[in-house]
Interface confidence: low
Amino acid sequence: AGVFELQIHSFGPGPGPGAPRSPCSARGPCRLFFRVCLKPGLSEEAAESPCALGAALSARGPVYTEQPEAPAPDLPLPNGLLQVPFRDAWPGTFSLIIETWREELGDQIGGPAWSLLARVTRRRRLAAGGPWARDIQRAGAWELRFSYRARCELPAVGTACTRLCRPRSAPSRCGPGLRPCAPLEDECEAPPVCRAGCSLEHGFCEQPGECRCLEGWTGPLCMVPASTSSCLGLRGPSSATTGCLVPGPGPCDGNPCANGGSCSETPGSFECTCPRGFYGLRCEVSGVTCADGPCFNGGLCVGGADPDSAYICHCPPGFQGSNCEKRVDRCSLQPCRNGGLCLDLGHALRCRCRAGFAGPRCEHNLDDCAGRACANGGTCVEGGGAHRCSCALGFGGRDCRERADPCAARPCAHGGRCYAHFSGLVCACAPGYMGSRCEFPVHPDGVSALPAAPPGLRPGDPQRYL
């Protein structure tokens, strides 16, 4: 686990002709805010693919009013870092997307208007725990200067935040082969699981499954005393078993200073030079308080009762996260009814409705039959948002405009012959059957005569209608 941090230094018009004077439109003053999106790997991903590593939104910057006579300087920016917490291992390779948004504060119907001003996408390699990386990127006529880094959160350490620390057991030093755990000198690295049977006293491992021997010991499980051993060239805590030195780090090896602090060795110890916003022996304590305005998106800041948190943000509806930096996925609440598609536009939700429905949540069922006539005596029927006509006999199709063959469905039973008729159809029954569809057998002693075809019709001719 850890945090990716992005610090925006400046955003303004790039060099060269055609640089814009102001980010604001003619509608009046505006202010800027930033969105950062992290995606794993170095592959070119679609812009709309999810920010799988996380995303964050900055606070709104100060209001900017265009001064038409003067070229735009670096624009007033939101204060503070953009922080994107990550739960799992830091991937090392990632795509960084930084969006600059403009919020127009003129008289807008329905509140402020948002628009994307610039977007930079860069694929990067970065180890956790390293120093700030600085970058300058151009997006159209705009130039963005920023720094970023990834840092682990205890107990995770290492370039991928996958190694864990544990409190050290011995008061004097870490156990055999275990280094002091940066960035906390009073903790030791949690040992990896060594090869089964590896001597606890004389062996250690840096990778799971291995068994490396301390000086003076040998064998696959470090059980065999070595006849001779040289302890030269090694530094670190003294081994009580052999009087030799176990390989170990110098005070600044692995950089014990957290949060981008730089380490300098002092006699027998080290000292951290911390960046702004962090302090403590190892720069491990964040100096952010409510006075620094850490709560984004209108969150209310209160001093934390928990000693480990100097402040707590109470987030407004629609936002969450320790700094109210994460927008709640409002579409997960399925606000759109009747199969509407939910779109979270950032400043608002929008429902894209299916045909036959309307309204902010597609809650309104349109009158499908309004203004829609069914031809040839058909009747309009509403249902499920779909317009449908119930057609008169002899007609079919969506609007009853197509002539239908009433005999196509072979309605006459027992071999009866079907004759299309202006009022529908007539069945001429085979001997021994009767009824409008020839469905009834005639009494054995009765005789049934085949009725003559209506004038002008030939039997079985469906093409001719009166």
Partner: antibody, heavy 118, light 108 residues
Framework: QVQLQESGPGLVKPSQTLSLTCTVS??????YYWSWIRQPPGKGLEWI?????????NYNPSLKSRVTISLDTSKNQFSLKLSSVTAADTAKYYC????????????WDQGTLVTVSS | EIVMTQSPGTLSLSPGERATLSCRAS???????LAWYQQKPGQAPRLLIY???SRATDIPDRFSGSGSGTDFTLTISRLEPEDFAVYYC?????????FGQGTKVEIK
């Protein structure tokens, strides 16, 4: 309102250990850094060291070998021990709270003058 | 360590005048880690400015701080009788915390 009150002897013999205690009232000792600063007569301020509520300490390298700052959260107190004192350690000793975020000293006590003399 | 040098050592002014005190660091100091204090005889120092330019609680607005990098300034726009004292700057960009040697503002 946070208040700090020092206690300890005003006179210490050379080579002995200077011991001072600072009691915090009006607020919890937890979640802040607490520091000691001294000022020799007629001179400027010198930072001695600090301690965090979890016991982490940082000392001025010029005094590091002789300084111990400790904390008793149950009594809302923190203490200074300066060993092997000499006349050069004669000063007014202040305890102070460090403002979270700017590392400035926002609350001070009135100070105790400690004289090192036989 | 970062050495903080204040100038002038003594500033002789009359009430109502403007006082400008300088503090120079031997290496760059982040804005967030520079503070100014006022100390009157027999009293503890009192925090005036933190973060180079933010006034501490209950500090009158005639006190203002500015500067960045290695050069910082404390300005008292109009000296009041109670402002005559010694002023110290202090940094904690790099351990150890260090103070300037002080500037004494005295009545002319």
């Amino acid at each position: 309102q946070v208040q700090l009150q020092e206690s300890g002897p005003g006179l210490v013999k050379p080579s002995q250990t200077l011991s001072l205690t600072c009691t915090v009232s009006g607020g919890s000792i937890s979640s802040y850094y607490w520091s000691w600063i001294r000022q020799p007569p007629g001179k400027g301020l010198e930072w001695i060291g600090y301690i965090f509520y979890n016991g982490i300490t940082n000392y001025n390298p010029s005094l590091k070998s002789r300084v111990t700052i400790s904390l008793d959260t149950s009594k809302n107190q923190f203490s200074l021990k300066l060993s092997s004192v000499t006349a050069a350690d004669t000063a007014k000793y202040y305890c102070a709270r460090i403002h979270s975020g700017s590392f400035s000293f926002d609350y001070w006590d009135q100070g105790t003058l400690v004289t090192v003399s036989s | 360590e970062i050495v903080m040098t204040q100038s002038p050592g003594t500033l002789s002014l009359s009430p109502g005048e403007r006082a400008t005190l300088s503090c120079r660091a031997s290496q760059s100091v982040s804005r967030g880690y520079l503070a100014w204090y006022q100390q009157k005889p027999g009293q503890a120092p009192r925090l005036l400015i933190y973060g180079a330019s933010s006034r501490a609680t209950d500090i009158p607005d005639r006190f203002s701080g500015s500067g960045s990098g290695t050069d910082f300034t404390l300005t008292i726009s109009r000296l009041e009788p109670e402002d005559f004292a010694v002023y110290y700057c202090q940094q904690y960009d790099t351990s150890p915390i260090t103070f300037g040697q002080g500037t004494k503002v005295e009545i002319k």
